[in-house]
């Protein structure tokens, strides 16, 4: 029932997971200098009956260089801030979708944990996307992919999000102007931005619903 | 199942303007965006824009910049392609495509410009 | 732009040989790469997605490799109907430009 893939990559785009289904797991990874501690947890596993889901086994990591197990403790935010994990963090999860059943939260962070989170999904997982900082969506199709099993295989679905760091003429609605694209951009720039003003109540709701679900953009 | 239906073939003179036409059907047409590509007789594939079906929005690419113009009818599920100021260059077929990964082409549609 | 180079141009093979088509990318396009089958006067038909992605309702003897600049499609086992062109392709940023395309004949 685990996902043999990662979800797919989208350029100039990252994801995540609002809730983990059932049976997803979270490597215990420290950062640099540290480790997991001897007795220490491999990965958290989200687990659960119809009504609750939780992360069972805790993560801890201890300093390399000693032989000490560190108490489980919030980081502070400054601490919390080179946190950088392949799954967008969002500090707001959207009430509908953490409180799925058969669904986890994300995990609390632990300490001296690892800048990026290692995952391993589960078929029915479902990831959302958003374009990074620079770049805005050309084409907002459905922005999300679901690990899906086929004829005894699992894929994921391809999300349907064009980002672009093309100059503009017009915006989308509650859309801001983009930034320079962080990668910059070559003088002899090889396609044009063209823009109309036909847009639709369903991009206002695409842009409102994206504002809802990632309320802290991670490049 | 997934269909994407182009017009007939065109002959044009030089100088003038043709407008191609690609119905999408089986699917929900503002989910995916549309590309346009084309080959010339005896070459390659050459991209030439994609358009947004749900806002309208088009990159097209530096060589076609100025001559083009892709829009799009949501009511009819259909996508077009208009390319002007023809030259017998322009010889070709030109095909659309679906989505991200240009998982679905139309048929083609062969323009000839001919004086 | 970003250039893509196919080779070989041409290829000569027979049923039930393997056969590698290789694309490079002149820069960094990570997994960002698709292959396309043309068939004389038919439209092209995606093979291959996301550099490793079989597409829907292709055989298994077609598969995908590669990250960055450098990619490989490999067909298994020749079957009589994969005599064609192949194209790369990559979506990393516009223009999405192809590779000039691989010609697989019969030997």
């Known amino acids: 029932e685990l996902c043999d893939d990662d979800p797919p990559e989208i350029p100039h785009a990252t994801f995540k997971a609002m809730a983990y289904k059932e049976g997803t797991m979270l490597n215990c990874e420290c950062k640099r200098g540290f480790r997991r501690i001897k007795s220490g947890s491999l990965y958290m596993l989200c687990t659960g009956n119809s009504s609750h889901s939780s992360w069972d086994n805790q993560c801890q990591c201890t300093s390399s260089a000693t032989r000490n197990t560190t108490k489980q403790v919030t980081p502070q935010p400054e601490e919390q801030k080179e946190r950088k994990t392949t799954e967008m963090q969002s500090p707001m999860q959207p009430v509908d979708q953490a409180s799925l059943p058969g669904h986890c939260r994300e995990p609390p962070p632990w300490e001296n944990e690892a800048t990026e989170r290692i995952y391993h999904f589960v078929v029915g997982q479902m990831v959302y996307y958003q374009c990074v900082q620079g770049y805005r969506a050309l084409h907002r199709g459905p922005a999300e992919s679901v690990c899906k099993m086929t004829h005894g295989k699992t894929r994921w679905t391809q999300p349907q999000l064009i980002c672009t760091g093309e100059m503009e003429t017009s915006q989308f609605p509650g859309e801001e102007k983009p930034q320079a694209s962080p990668e910059g951009r070559p003088e002899s720039e090889t396609s044009c931005l063209v823009t109309t003003t036909d847009f639709q109540i369903q991009t206002e709701m695409a842009a409102t619903m994206e504002t809802s679900i990632f309320t802290t953009e991670y490049q | 199942q997934v269909q994407l239906v182009q017009s007939g073939a065109e002959v044009k003179k030089p100088g003038a303007s043709v407008k191609v036409s690609c119905k999408g059907s089986g699917y929900t047409f503002t989910d995916y965006a549309m590309h346009w590509v084309r080959q010339a007789p005896g070459q390659g594939l050459e991209w030439m824009g994609v358009?947004?079906?749900?806002?309208?929005?088009?990159i097209y690419a530096q060589k076609f910049q100025g001559r083009v113009t892709m829009t799009v009818d949501k009511s009819t599920s259909t996508a077009y392609m208009e390319l002007s100021s023809l030259r017998s260059e322009d010889t070709a077929v030109y095909y659309c495509?679906?989505?991200?990964?240009?998982?679905?082409w139309g048929q083609g549609t062969t323009v000839t410009v001919s004086s | 732009d970003i250039q893509m180079t196919q080779s070989p141009s041409s290829l000569s093979a027979s049923v039930g040989d393997r056969v590698t088509i290789t694309c490079r990318a002149s820069q960094d396009i990570s997994n960002y790469l698709e292959w396309y089958q043309q068939k004389p006067g038919k439209a092209p038909k995606l093979l291959i997605y996301n550099a490793k992605t079989l597409a829907e309702g292709v055989p298994s003897r077609f598969s995908g490799s590669g990250s960055g600049t450098d990619f490989t499609l490999t067909i298994s086992s020749l079957q009589p109907e994969d005599f064609a062109t192949y194209y790369c392709q990559h979506h990393y940023d516009t223009p999405y430009t192809f590779g000039q395309g691989t010609k697989l004949e019969i030997k």
């Open positions: 495509a679906r989505g991200v990964t240009f998982d679905y």
């Open positions: 358009i947004s079906t749900y806002s309208g929005d088009a």
